[in-house]
Interface confidence: low
């Protein structure tokens, strides 16, 4: 019986962009301004998200889809659907509770977000350091000294530096 009743539910005929208005004998009414319904058969429309303050509008709200926000310059999105904006730092820094701080020696950050990560340990791969690391850049590993025959130059392209904890594909 429940299944039959749901098939006859007049609300199921209400398309996205409308809601089933119980106050008007279950007529499909358009979503009011600044609200939306992304699926058919909704009994309410959701209020459109407002991109205020540090948020800015990436996509306007429509009757069938919510607004989408991103962050104003100097900030970046965090969380699903850009639920938060976090302050950018400079390359070579990470964001702490006390603000942007330089990466400690032996670590780097090549982005404006995220944390400082340890330099690659070339010796773990039996390689030597070709280019020293900085706060902004990882070290570049080169061939191990044993790989170089006498007189050979070390202009061979270095192996690409990889993120710590990631194995080669």
């Amino acid at each position: 019986f429940e299944r039959t009743r749901s098939l006859q539910d007049p609300c199921s005929n209400c398309p996205a962009g409308t809601f089933c208005d119980n106050n008007r004998n279950q007529i499909c009414s358009p979503c009011p301004p600044n609200s939306f319904s992304s699926a058919g058969g909704q009994r309410t429309c959701d209020i459109c998200r407002q991109c205020k303050g540090v948020f800015r509008t990436r996509k306007e709200c429509s009757s069938t889809s919510n607004a989408e926000c991103d962050c104003t310059p100097g900030f970046h999105c965090l969380g699903a659907g850009c639920s938060m904006c976090e302050q950018d730092c400079k390359q070579g820094q990470e964001l702490t509770k006390k603000g942007c701080k330089d990466c400690c020696f032996g670590t780097f950050n090549d982005q404006k977000r995220g944390i400082c990560r340890p330099w690659t340990n070339c010796s773990l791969d039996g390689k030597s350091v070709l280019v020293n690391g900085t706060k902004e850049r990882d070290v570049v590993c080169g061939p191990s000294p044993a790989d170089l025959s006498p007189g050979a130059s070390s202009v061979t392209p270095p192996a690409p530096a990889r993120e710590p904890g990631h194995s080669p594909q």
């Epitope: 609300c11 199921s12 909704q42 209020i47 459109c48 407002q50 699903a80 659907g81």
Partner: nanobody
Framework: EVQLLESGGGEVQPGGSLRLSCAAS????????MAWFRQAPGKEREFVSR????????DYVESVKGRFTISRDNPKNTLYLQMSSLRAEDTAVYYC???????????????????WGQGTLVTVKP
């Protein structure tokens, strides 16, 4: 009083299956969208899947598409999550949540949900 109670968690081997249930009481279950979230140790709570009040619209996080299926039985006031081809990275406490009638947030964010269950632990290990 609104209550949500999850069950069905447990330990399973990679590639195995589990079916989680969320029993709701104290409110008109059939009038609200519902969702599953999960939280792995040391990580933020993560959206898994959401189902509209009438089952007409579903949404999944990319990593579970094709493996997890959300469903609901409105007469029984119960939400389900069928999980198959489970992986180690699916290990987490799984929560069901009730969608607010109105929300200014994306449906994948926890702020969109007003009532939460206590969670059920899913462990995937060989």
């Amino acid at each position: 009083e609104v209550q949500l109670l999850e069950s069905g968690g447990g330990e399973v081997q990679p590639g195995g299956s589990l079916r989680l249930s969320c029993a709701a009481s104290g409110w008109a279950f059939g009038n609200y969208g519902m969702a599953w979230f999960r939280q792995a140790p040391g990580k933020e709570r993560e959206f898994v899947s959401r189902l509209a009040w009438n089952g007409g619209s579903t949404d999944y996080v990319e990593s579970v598409k094709g493996r997890f299926t959300i469903s609901r039985d409105n007469p029984k006031n119960t939400l389900y999550l069928q999980m198959s081809s489970l992986r180690a990275e699916d290990t987490a406490v799984y929560y069901c949540a009730r969608q607010r009638s109105y929300s200014r947030y994306d449906i994948r964010t926890p702020q969109t949900y007003d009532y939460w269950g206590q969670g059920t632990l899913v462990t995937v290990k060989p």
